[in-house]
């Protein structure tokens, strides 16, 4: 069964800046990746970025840079300032859509005791 992993890291240089990394462990080819915060995209979460392998990347504030790391993993950097900036207990979710298998999603957040720079 395919799985999704999520890592959340706070940047040591900017304490309110986050890096989210997500990956898909499965055999299908990825059609779309949706990154959201505040819960899954289908359950009240707010979309931060949508990544398509052919048609490019769309992102919304406070997302600063979304990119493909490999064919099955992505990363997203969030701005650390402004009213919409994330806080330490924010939940981030990644949903990978693979054709024709379907979609798999997982969520993660910064561990309560995390030091800046440590992976969740």
């Amino acid at each position: 069964t395919p799985e999704v992993w999520v890592q959340v890291r706070m940047e040591a240089t900017e304490l309110s800046s986050f890096t989210i990394r997500c990956g898909f462990l499965g055999s299908g080819s990825i059609s779309l990746v949706t990154v959201s915060w505040g819960g899954p995209n289908g359950a009240g979460g707010t979309t931060l970025a949508v990544l398509h392998p052919e048609r490019g990347i769309r992102q919304w504030a406070p997302a600063r840079q979304a990119r493909w790391e490999t064919q099955s993993s992505i990363s997203l950097i969030l701005e650390g300032s402004g009213a919409s900036s994330p806080c330490a207990n924010t939940t981030f979710c990644c949903k990978f859509a693979s054709f024709p298998e379907g979609s798999w999603e997982a969520c993660g957040s910064l561990p309560p005791s995390s030091d800046p720079g440590l992976s969740a």
């Epitope: 080819s29 398509h52 979609s103």
Partner: antibody, heavy 120, light 107 residues
Framework: EVQLVESGGGLVQPGGSLRLSCAAS????????MSWVRQAPGKGLELVAA????????YYPDTVKGRFTISRDDAENSLYLQMNSLRAEDTAVYYC?????????????WGQGTLVTVSS | EIVMTQSPPTLSLSPGERVTLSCKAS??????VAWYQEKPGQAPRLLIY???HRFTGIPARFSGSGSGTDFTLTISSLQPEDFAVYYC?????????FGQGTKLEIK
């Protein structure tokens, strides 16, 4: 304008074979996942075959697995469904459809359908 | 397999009425739910995708809502051309499945 035009339907005896074609135009065919969906008389919709945009992944429900084969020719902008060992219960209108990644794989374009009748 | 159950199977209504069609999934399907309209002799037509997003050209009287396992399609004021069969569909997990359909007929 997106257009999908099916052909190849007709009357065939039980145990016989038929090859359906779908000619696509008005969009970049190679960038889309495609499917065949059927509707038997008085029944609902059933997805009987799907193929990923790269042609590497296919899907068949148990009802047609081993008998139906979906394929595509991106150079010809065409989708095919080879149907072997046909049964009376395969009698239906067969639709060619296009999946939109950004719509959660919803089928945003359909052909007008081609009727397949399996009867002796 | 995720089973999509639509209710009721048939509804008899008059033009101008408001109608809500129900679709229940046997397990969570996230937001990967679409609604299609089918008329006799015509191909199915996409109305709603991602639970609540209207497809291009679909009138505002059509709206979708729900989450998890319970979804609805609402037509705020039925027009004569709305009498048809409506199907919900999940593309969250293979095998992708449709509901059995709800037929809207004129009273």
């Amino acid at each position: 304008e997106v257009q999908l035009v099916e052909s190849g339907g007709g009357l065939v005896q039980p145990g016989g074979s038929l090859r359906l074609s779908c000619a696509a135009s008005g969009f970049t065919f190679s960038s889309y996942h495609m499917s065949w969906v059927r509707q038997a008389p008085g029944k609902g919709l059933e997805l009987v075959a799907a193929i990923s945009r790269d042609g590497d992944s296919t899907y068949y429900p148990d009802t047609v697995k081993g008998r139906f084969t979906i394929s595509r020719d991106d150079a010809e902008n065409s989708l095919y469904l080879q149907m072997n060992s046909l049964r009376a219960e395969d009698t239906a209108v067969y639709y060619c459809s296009r999946h939109e990644d950004y719509f959660g794989f919803a089928m945003d374009s359909w052909g007008q359908g081609t009727l397949v009748t399996v009867s002796s | 397999e995720i089973v999509m159950t639509q209710s009721p199977p048939t509804l008899s209504l008059s033009p101008g009425e408001r109608v809500t069609l129900s679709c229940k999934a046997s397990q969570s399907v996230s937001n990967d739910v679409a609604w299609y309209q089918e008329k006799p002799g015509q191909a199915p037509r996409l109305l709603i995708y991602y639970v609540s997003h209207r497809f291009t050209g679909i009138p505002a009287r059509f709206s979708g809502s729900g989450s998890g396992t319970d979804f609805t399609l609402t037509i705020s004021s039925l027009q004569p051309e709305d009498f048809a069969v409506y199907y919900c569909h999940q593309a969250y997990r293979s095998p992708w499945t449709f509901g059995q359909g709800t037929k809207l007929e004129i009273k």
